[in-house]
Amino acid sequence: LVPHLGDREKRDSVCPQGKYIHPQNNSICCTKCHKGTYLYNDCPGPGQDTDCRECESGSFTASENHLRHCLSCSKCRKEMGQVEISSCTVDRDTVCGCRKNQYRHYWSENLFQCFNCSLCLNGTVHLSCQEKQNTVCTCHAGFFLRENECVSCSNCKKSLECTKLCLPQIENVKGTEDSGTT
């Protein structure tokens, strides 16, 4: 199957790499603008220069292009705990990340929140905390994993998934409940 090409891709494919077809004259191929710049005016004719201008502060282009405007720099989302790893330059967008001992959780493709890495109290670290994944904990006997924390089996109710891990404790809890004590 031939992939469906958009109008811009169709126009670009007529010209050699690094050039694009003039929007008003499809017999002219203009040189694309370098990253960090944008298209101010198309080249007037074959072999003539494209008029490219540098992106203004707060904007960027990360690859060669024939965009009429630079792209706005991203802002790190403080409300999601994000911090700026590197600031925006004319040829690179802002890079956002998390603080030390935190990981990123992506709620969607373009939205992440920073959370503290689990310390595995009452357990051991099975896998260390990574940039995009929390620590994986293994809990000690008498504890079960809930929301990535090791919780005492005394907090395990019969209806919960922890019953298999906490079977002896559940029997004890059941016994105290039956006898009417708390």
Partner: nanobody, 119 residues
Framework: EVQLLESGGGLVQPGGSLRLSCAAS????????MVWVRQAPGKGLEWVSH????????YYADSVEGRFTISRDNSKNTLYLQMNSLRAEDTAVYYC????????????RGQGTLVTVSS
């Protein structure tokens, strides 16, 4: 005790509008970032929008950008979601929630309000 109560859902035709409200109590509303999430039939939770404590910072999922508007009235402890140009794919149960703090789950969210977009 944290309480979040959504209202304003209902049946609406494609292209129509609805305004959801979320009445909050049991915590200092004016200090908290608030979130709207939704769950379509047979799907997982989708982050729709959020708004910071002061109402100055907002976020919208690509699927609702330009159609939905999140706002809040801190004097009334109420969160809103104005939904315009509704589409069939917006059909879902909409929940308001407190921004998670401890991990990627919602400790506090409402019981939800159903929005059905159908002709």
């Amino acid at each position: 005790e944290v309480q979040l109560l959504e209202s304003g859902g209902g049946l609406v035709q494609p292209g129509g509008s609805l305004r959801l409200s979320c009445a909050a109590s049991g915590f200092t509303f004016e200090n908290k970032t608030m979130v709207w999430v939704r769950q379509a039939p047979g799907k997982g939770l989708e982050w729709v929008s959020h708004i910071d404590a002061t109402g100055t910072i907002t976020y919208y999922a690509d699927s609702v950008e330009g159609r939905f508007t999140i706002s809040r009235d801190n004097s009334k402890n109420t969160l809103y979601l104005q939904m315009n140009s509704l589409r069939a794919e917006d059909t879902a149960v909409y929940y308001c929630a407190l921004l998670p703090k401890r991990g990627p789950w919602f400790d506090y969210r409402g019981q939800g309000t159903l929005v059905t977009v159908s002709s």
